[in-house]
């Protein structure tokens, strides 16, 4: 509009300002290292810090480091964010017994409950699991290793393995200390309760399926063991993991004995289109960061799409010209970055681990 | 913990509009961006359109032209005004904060808010 021109050439001519054409306003320019929290700021008031990745802003302000979920007894609960930590919890099958801010200091495996005893609440991540006195008729399970044996019929007791508790069992007294195997082991000890059936009525040819052994005396140890690469789902099943050799993706977390590996797109990229664990279509994110070197104030209310790079590689953020246009070239499509075969069976089922890469292989 | 609640959702015939809104709750809603993914019965969850703090957007190429982003920090909501309507639009629509950090894996749909179901019939 002509009638903006003075204004324009004006507020163009404060270094600490910028003129935004979308709104035809003058605005400002936050400081370098601080990011706009709306559209045309007015003063400093409304620019704030830009943290370092796996940090966020607390509420006083600082940068402040997310907790760390890497412990093998741990889990992300809830990602690290612009604003607040990540939050972690026990895996599953263990649940927390010295709680602290967003995390837990020890993890304990769920308990089982002994012969005679049933579940009345099962674990969770935060609490053991409690045990009752079976109601008369039921057997106990277990107690011996007859009573231990593949059901004949397609009947399921129980239909999915539940932890269980008292503190008569050394679970309780029992902290993760080594790495995944030990994880691994100690779980298969204490993960199915009595009176479940060793392999949920499936024969022990399954893929994925180590030959599983009667319990041994007086125990619970009727959990069936997958082959490495295949966990135990829900129903039971030995179900393959997720595979993340695909180059735009990184593993977020281990395949484990009761639940697959999850994989996510690598640093840089979005995930656009979903699958089971993992992500079908990874594409470079597509909206520059503030401290690129862009100038994003300029770009106010332009479509920042982008022309697909490499795989691995950022969108072009290279400064846009003084008038606030976008460069001609920018004109992309996030269908078109990766190959568009990726996705079209999708959802993709957790037993059959994509493998597709970006580069056709 | 973060809390998104969309709403605006409903059943529309083709060619018709619908504004949604995603407000949030526990959290200030000026962090660097947000998204909105949708997911259709039986199918993946996917990207539908990003904006930043500063206003810049982004759109998937199937809603370019027909469904704007906009951003309300000082009610803590983003809206998508979604036109012309077509059928293969119909899904669950669900915003998602700060998606550079907290969408790289398959889990954008459904994991800060129950998301608003649009439904268009021909």
């Known amino acids: 509009f002509p009638q903006d021109r003075p204004f324009e050439d004006t507020c163009r001519g404060n270094p600490g300002h910028y003129y935004d054409k979308a709104v035809r306003r003058c605005c400002y320019r936050c400081p370098t290292g601080l990011f706009p929290t709306q559209q045309c700021p007015q003063r400093p008031a409304d620019c704030r810090k830009q943290c370092e990745p796996d940090y966020y802003l607390d509420e006083a302000g600082r940068c402040t480091a997310c907790v760390s979920c890497s412990r093998d007894d741990l889990v992300e609960k809830m990602p690290c964010a612009w604003n607040s930590s990540r939050v972690c919890e026990c895996q599953p099958g263990m649940f927390c017994a010295v709680s602290v801010v967003n995390s837990c200091a020890r993890c304990f495996f769920h308990s089982v409950c002994p012969a005679g005893m049933i579940v009345k609440f099962p674990g969770t991540a935060q609490k053991n699991t409690v045990c009752e006195p079976a109601s008369p008729g039921v057997s106990p399970a277990c107690a011996s290793p007859e009573n231990c044996k593949e059901p004949s019929s397609g009947t399921i007791p129980q239909a999915k393995p539940t932890p269980v508790s008292p503190a008569t069992s050394n679970a309780s007294t029992m902290p993760l200390r080594g790495g995944t195997r030990l994880a691994q082991e100690a779980a298969s000890k204490l993960t199915r309760a009595p009176g479940s059936p060793s392999s949920v009525g499936r024969p022990s040819s399954d893929p994925g399926l180590s030959p599983t052994q009667p319990c041994p005396q007086g125990s619970g140890d009727c959990r069936k063991q997958c082959e490495p690469d295949y966990y135990l789902d829900e129903a039971g099943r030995c179900t393959a993991c997720v595979s993340c050799s695909r180059d735009d993706l990184v593993e977020k977390t281990p395949c484990a004995w009761n639940s697959s590996r999850i994989c996510e797109c690598r640093p840089g990229m979005i995930c656009a289109t979903s699958a089971t664990n993992s992500c079908a279509r990874c594409v470079p994110y597509p909206i520059c960061a503030a401290e690129t070197g862009t100038k994003p104030q300029d770009m106010a209310e332009k479509d920042t799409t982008f022309e697909a790079p490499p795989v691995g590689t950022q969108p072009d953020c290279s400064p846009t010209p003084e008038n606030g246009e976008a460069p001609a070239s920018t004109s992309p499509t996030l269908s078109s970055l990766v190959d568009s075969q990726a996705s079209k069976t999708l959802p993709i089922p957790t037993s059959a681990p994509i493998a597709l890469s970006s580069t056709g292989k | 913990e973060v809390q998104l609640v969309e709403s605006g959702g409903g059943s529309v015939q083709a060619g018709g509009s619908l504004r949604l809104s995603c407000t949030a709750s526990?959290?200030?809603?000026?962090?660097?961006?947000m998204a909105w993914y949708r997911q259709a019965p039986g199918n993946a969850c996917e990207l539908v359109s990003i904006i930043s703090a500063d206003g810049r957007t982004y759109y998937t190429d199937s809603v370019k032209g027909r469904f704007t982003i906009s951003r309300d920090n000082a009610k803590n909501t983003v809206f998508l005004y979604l036109n012309s309507l077509q059928p293969e639009d119909t899904a669950v629509y669900y915003c998602?904060?700060?998606?550079?950090?907290?969408?790289?894996?398959?889990?954008?749909?459904?994991?800060w808010g129950p998301g608003t179901q649009v439904t268009v019939s021909s």
């Open positions: 998602a904060p700060d998606p550079r950090r907290n969408c790289r894996g398959g889990y954008c749909c459904g994991n």
């Open positions: 526990r959290f200030t809603f000026d962090g660097p961006d």
